[in-house]
Interface confidence: low
């Protein structure tokens, strides 16, 4: 192309894209002859007006193509140009060099461990499907009805049973592989269980032998029964059982290479299946000899429940025991089989729940326990299995023994119950990293507290802070305690208390929290680099 | 195979500060907890308390609160013991030994000498 | 605190000779209780935990066993390297304590 036509093409430019630069005399002069046509002198007045402004807007009509195209080649402008465009590449060099600088830089993120069902939320026991369902409804086919709610609660996984065959302390007449008439047949079973998969809820059977009788291992017949379980585990782990609970394995004599060769048996099958042993010991050497046999068995025993309900306490027995099961997966629970009330005041309830779902581990619950059923607070219930009320006439042995505000019903409406909390903790504990597979650091908050906080990577991360005591504390958080990567920071936003009354989403400022009696807090806070 | 390997001996004046180190091979030393055991001259076995390893929270025996002070790297997989304001009685042989409840103390460091003499 | 009291403080004995060492617990230990053997170039090495658990790697020889309070430690035949300091430690409670120690010396 000639630099001529270069000149072309740029005036072509100039006359299409800036119409309003040219010279508008021409205008004018039309205009002009079109009035003095005209007969009305009032128009007249008016095109001379408008003729005056015309002619003052042809003094402000800006730079002519031929002045424009002179200006633009100045030396000056041709710099600033150049200027600019360099500026411009340079900026943006600069820009992808940054961002390659942070990609190359920035901290690889942390790989996520191996995670197992039973490590992602709660585990929900229900040991007696009649006490479970109210009278005259336990069976298999009514707790299919009741999964619903189970999903609710954001649970993983259903401990149920046992259900086989038991005639009390009869090893002849105890049978792992029949399931008891009373509860229903295998078909039942079978039906649960797929209902149960589709709402993403684990089945594990609880095979604890001689459930009914004085001794659950028949303690004289120790092989005949470990035969009849190994047969049992194959069974059922065939009809598509997640898992197994034994029970009372203090009363089985070399529990540690029976659990190993069940184990063995279980994760044979599939690494994907649990065997959980429950025990009423709460001596942690008793508790560890049973641990150190045996990888990844889930033990749930009475360890936290003589905690004595102080902070100081607490904090010792948890640390002490993480500290003595090292990497090893947890469960956290009061006992093997009751309820959170048979050993803790009503006060203490919500504390627990709010420590038991943020501690590193699976927490363990049974049936009830996210309404704080009480035997105690029933006339005539058993305190191992109450029946559960699910609504005002679930106990009709005694007209208005049962309020509303201690239902699933009662509670499921209101916002600030024990049920509502339990959903929101359950909900937060499987699905945020730091609360599903974080670090864990405890550290010191002052006298008759408990506080530790979880983190992974660069996810939000949690501080928990319990006031186990009667009356209302200061926090003294010393992050001293704290490694580095776990460093507190001035303020964190309040996810819950346990208390009605605070502000949820607020920022609190840790060097000045208070804490109400029996209250406990969980707060979160971004990860700072 | 387990080895707790401890640093070499001290000779101190009074007054001055000692750190003596115990580097845990074998294991990871986030699963057990870790004591320290002073030896007098011609004494017995005495225990000085432990750190929790998983949390790296210490507890002293009561005759070792104030001047002395266990700490931990994990990432170096080694229990420290620091001991501030040297006293002459402080001349002994310190043991870091590892421990799980049922563990207790199974594994032992070879013993740093110390010795403080004006 | 739990106090344990050891005897004797040192005992002379001939190899194959069997020797036995006792210590006694002032309070209840339920069992948790270890012998320790310290040689002479100061090196400790952990021989029986649960009072009577044998240490993957100790002798046969070496027993323990326990009678109410009193916990024993047995060697049933003296070799060379058996003569040494002998610790009882009891962790069934904060603080830990040991023993006095036993010297088992070469008569």
């Known amino acids: 192309m000639s630099q001529d036509t270069e000149v072309d093409m740029k005036e072509v430019e100039l006359n299409e894209l800036e119409p309003e630069k040219q010279p508008m005399n021409a205008a004018s002069g039309a205009a002009m002859s079109l009035a003095g046509a005209e007969k009305n002198g009032l128009v007249k007045i008016k095109v001379a007006e408008d003729e005056a402004e015309a002619a003052a807007a042809a003094k402000f009509t800006g730079l002519s193509k031929e002045e424009l195209l002179k200006v633009a080649g100045s030396p000056g402008w041709v710099r600033t140009r150049w200027a600019l465009l360099l500026l411009f590449w340079l900026g943006w060099l600069g820009m992808l060099a940054g961002a390659v600088v942070i990609i190359v830089r920035a901290p690889r993120c942390r790989e996520l461990p191996a995670q197992k069902w039973w490590h992602t939320g709660a585990l929900y026991r229900i040991g007696d499907l009649q006490a479970f369902q109210g009278h005259g409804a336990g069976n298999l086919a009514g707790l299919k009805g009741r999964l619903d709610y189970l999903s609710s609660l954001k649970v993983k996984g259903l401990v149920l049973g046992p259900i086989h065959k038991n005639q009390k302390d009869d090893v002849a007449q105890t049978d792992l592989l029949q399931i008891d008439p009373n509860f229903g047949s295998k078909e039942d079973f079978d039906s649960l269980l797929q209902s149960a998969k589709k709402k993403s809820i684990r089945v594990i059977l609880d095979l604890t032998p001689n459930y009914r009788g004085e001794n659950s291992w028949f303690s004289t017949q120790v092989d005949t029964v470990a035969t009849k379980v190994k047969d049992a585990l194959e069974f059922w782990l065939q009809a598509g059982v997640d898992g197994f609970q034994v029970r009372d394995i203090e009363n089985l004599k070399d529990a540690s290479s029976f659990l190993a060769e069940w184990q063995n048996i279980t994760k044979g099958f599939s690494e994907d299946r649990l065997l959980i042993a429950g025990t009423n010991s709460s001596d942690l050497q008793q508790i560890l000899s049973l641990l150190e046999s045996n990888k990844d068995l889930l033990l749930t025993s009475s360890y936290l429940s003589d905690s004595g309900s102080t902070g100081e306490h607490t904090k010792s027995l948890v640390t002490q025991y993480l500290n003595a099961t090292g990497n090893r997966w947890c469960s956290w629970s009061l006992s093997q089989a009751r309820l959170l009330t048979s050993f803790l005041p009503a006060q203490l309830l919500r504390l627990y729940q709010l420590m038991l779902f943020t501690l590193p581990g699976t927490p363990v619950f049974s049936y009830g326990d996210e309404i704080g059923l009480d035997a105690a607070a029933l006339p005539g219930q058993p305190m191992e299995a109450p029946v559960m009320l699910w609504d005002e006439s679930s106990f009709p042995d005694i007209p208005g023994a049962v309020s509303a505000n201690m239902t699933v019903k009662g509670q499921s409406e209101d916002p600030g119950s024990l049920l509502s909390l339990f959903r929101r903790l359950s909900d937060q504990r499987s699905k945020e990293r730091s609360l599903l597979h974080g670090d864990f650091h405890a550290f010191s908050a002052g006298p008759g507290l408990f506080s530790y906080i979880r983190h992974w990577d660069q996810n939000e991360r949690f501080l928990v802070v319990l006031n186990f005591g009667d009356v209302g504390l200061s926090a003294g958080l010393q992050a001293s305690d704290l490694p580095a990567s776990a460093s507190l920071p001035a303020k964190a936003d309040l996810l819950l208390s346990t208390q009605p009354g605070r502000e949820e989403g607020s920022p609190l400022e840790l060097e000045r929290l208070k804490l109400e009696p029996h209250e406990g807090l969980l707060l979160r806070f971004p990860y700072a680099a | 195979q387990i080895q707790l390997v401890q640093s070499g001996p001290e000779l101190k004046k009074p007054g001055e500060t000692v750190k003596i180190s115990c580097k845990a091979s074998?294991?990871?030393?986030?699963?057990?907890?870790m004591n320290w055991v002073k030896q007098a001259p011609g004494k017995g076995l005495k225990w000085m308390g432990w750190?929790?390893?998983?949390?790296?929270?210490?507890t002293y025996a009561d005759d070792f609160k104030g001047r002395f002070a266990f700490s931990l790297e994990t990432s170096a997989s080694t229990a420290s013991l620091q001991i501030n304001n040297l006293k002459n009685e402080d001349t002994a042989t310190y043991f870091c030994?590892?421990?799980?409840?049922?563990?207790?103390?199974?594994?032992w460091g070879q013993g740093t000498s110390v010795t403080v003499s004006s | 605190d739990i106090q344990l009291t050891q005897s004797p403080s040192s005992l002379s004995a001939s190899l194959g000779e069997r020797v036995s060492l006792t210590c006694r617990a002032s309070?209840?230990?339920?069992?948790?209780l270890s012998w320790l053997q310290q040689k002479p170039d100061g090196t400790i090495k952990r021989l029986i935990y649960?009072?009577?658990t044998l240490d993957s790697g100790v002798p046969k020889r070496f027993s323990g066993s326990r009678s109410g309070s009193d916990y024993s430690l047995t060697i049933s035949s003296l070799e060379s390297e058996d003569f040494a300091d002998y610790y009882c430690?009891?962790?069934?409670?904060?603080?830990?304590?040991f023993g006095g120690g036993t010297k088992v010396e070469i008569k």
């Open positions: 030994t590892r421990s799980v409840i049922t563990y207790t103390m199974d594994y």
């Open positions: 074998g294991y990871s030393i986030t699963n057990f907890g």
């Open positions: 750190v929790n390893t998983y949390t790296g929270e210490p």
């Open positions: 309070q209840e230990i339920s069992g948790y």
């Open positions: 649960a009072a009577s």
């Open positions: 430690l009891q962790y069934a409670s904060y603080p830990r304590t």
